[in-house]
Amino acid sequence: SPVPFGPEGRLEDKLHKPKATQTEVKPSVRFNLRTSKDPEHEGCYLSVGHSQPLEDCSFNMTAKTFFIIHGWTMSGIFENWLHKLVSALHTREKDANVVVVDWLPLAHQLYTDAVNNTRVVGHSIARMLDWLQEKDDFSLGNVHLIGYSLGAHVAGYAGNFVKGTVGRITGLDPAGPMFEGADIHKRLSPDDADFVDVLHTYTRSFGLSIGIQMPVGHIDIYPNGGDFQPGCGLNDVLGSIAYGTITEVVKCEHERAVHLFVDSLVNQDKPSFAFQCTDSNRFKKGICLSCRKNRCNSIGYNAKKMRNKRNSKMYLKTRAGMPFRVYHYQMKIHVFSYKNMGEIEPTFYVTLYGTNADSQTLPLEIVERIEQNATNTFLVYTEEDLGDLLKIQLTWEGASQSWYNLWKEFRSYLSQPRNPGRELNIRRIRVKSGETQRKLTFCTEDPENTSISPGRELWFRKCRDGWRMKNETSPTVELP
């Protein structure tokens, strides 16, 4: 379809103008330097070759410069997240230049047309950056491009086209359709900036994935596996992206990347940490809570620069709202014997008791199955900081809560009607905190009583060896 701009990225504004003689030509990309946290303030519109607006709005050549790039839109008006992000940047980096890249005329199109327009918008940003580089003291290394959805790929184009290398690009749930599997020069990629970090919050392996699934940065962070975000509800609904309609679920999950980034700016005392892992399933098993060899990082603005030879996929769990931080724990439970287990997997819950607080009852998600005479690893997370752990209550749920399990129990009963009680034996639980990297072993309160059966509980207390540090580095990072 025809693209509504000329080679200089200018839009012929013929809307509501019946006569061709009335046509006025306007820039299709505008750069608004937000000089104040006040949304009422008009800011200054920057234009290549015109230095006056830089002076009028006190552009700080030696400070950090943020370019915020919105994505495809079904509205002629900025979406609400933009104000929150600008405000958060002003709060965190008081001397920084915050520039809103307004490409609404080219983004408020059919999605396919908006995608076709990303390249020209990237060119416009690159031209602006090339011009700014001509000024004394302006450094491309101080430039941080922040692009949401389609805007992330615009940032990629800008980084690709600019003379030199921008300091950082943050991709906030980069758009998936028409970019998944694309050549690196046609999407955001690690070579577009000195450091490219990406948050993926709406990826789907089935149906339409609004956000890109593939890793596209130096670090790619997948909160909650990168798909179903807590607090967004109706998780089984795949939002339609027909022109003019988009479900609240899609908006909530896709936009969550922005809010996670905002959270990292305004709640720097509550940083969220992500952990390197090969895939979401392994992370759910609790296998990947290591901080050795740069395997963990803060997410969002506070991310430590990591230039890996390969893409680094990282995972974390979050709360449903700000502050998003949770506390991750790896639980290793060695099952040394069990009897009469039948077909069904047990449903376990743990409650953690700490010096600061006690957790709620937390489910142990069995990703595959409970292995006998083996160490089974689980991931649990709490919304509150429990402090040092003191004891653990392990509960085996009694009555089955799913029809599937009830059916399996019924079948087991038919095949073994006199099936004696199911039981398994656990002597100790090893716990590792993701946030502190400390390890602790818990032993059963009564060394003689290590068995647990449905509807029963088992208590574990800190073993006598106490906390053990195993040369693991804490994820605490220096804030920029």
């Epitope: 505008r30 937000r34 008009e42 900025f78 929150k84 408020h108």
Partner: antibody
């Protein structure tokens, strides 16, 4: 100073259309969104939609989407709101309101235009 | 759509006293909440934007607080000209919606 001046009161028959104008002055018309809000007698304020005057992009409240059209004439710094297929429940005061840079809050309002729909 | 609820339809307060008006959103709207004052026959007037940001020209006795779903407009010492109807409005998601209003009357 910023001023939004609206057209005068209108009396319309059910099924007809009404077009209300809002002339802006005291600021750069294309730099801020313009919104339309109505208030039926004794009712809460109701957002109808908004326009980005820079290029004409609009956003509407689904409730009015099939009946409302918001346009602008940048040369005259004027926004328009046309509501079609009028019914008696459309009797209200219609306001234009200037949005902030992000279009979220409305610091300046027109004086209001009373539209009466009666057979 | 997000439903804005102003639980008190009418609030009676004496001049010089403090008035506290509340507004609740049906879902989290962060700080995207604005307060307006409307007098009979007049257009609304913006008092507070983005939950707590003051507006130039608005007396300092008007202040706003809250985040998420619960918001408050406080008038520290009521003046005679403050008796009017007060509306809250969210701009977190379209359609933007207003509360039904709280009428502040002289006790």
């Amino acid at each position: 100073q910023v001023q939004l001046v609206q057209s005068g009161a209108e009396v319309k028959k059910p099924g007809a259309s009404v077009k209300v104008s809002c002339k802006a002055s005291g600021y750069t018309f294309t730099d801020y969104t313009m919104h339309w809000v109505r208030q039926a007698p004794g009712q809460r304020l109701e957002w109808m939609g908004g326009i980005n005057p820079y290029y004409g992009g609009t956003t509407y409240n689904e409730k009015f989407k099939d009946r409302v059209t918001i346009t602008r004439d940048t040369s005259a710094s004027t926004a328009y709101m046309e509501l079609s297929s009028l019914r008696s429940e459309d009797t209200a005061v219609y306001y234009c309101a200037k949005g902030d840079y992000y279009g979220g809050s409305y610091n300046y309002w027109g004086q209001g235009t009373t539209v009466t729909v009666s057979s | 759509e997000i439903v804005m609820t102003q639980s008190l339809a009418t609030l009676s307060v004496s001049p010089g006293e403090r008035a506290t008006l509340s507004c609740r959103a049906s879902q989290d709207i962060s700080n995207s909440l604005h307060w307006y004052q409307q007098k009979p026959g007049q257009a609304p007037r913006l008092l507070i934007k983005y939950a707590s940001q003051s507006i130039s020209g608005i007396p300092a006795r008007f202040s706003g607080s809250g985040s998420g779903t619960e918001f408050t407009l406080t008038i520290s010492s009521l003046q005679s000209e403050d008796f009017a109807v007060y509306y809250c409005q969210q701009s977190n998601s379209w359609p933007y919606t207003f509360g039904q209003g709280t009428k502040l009357e002289i006790k």
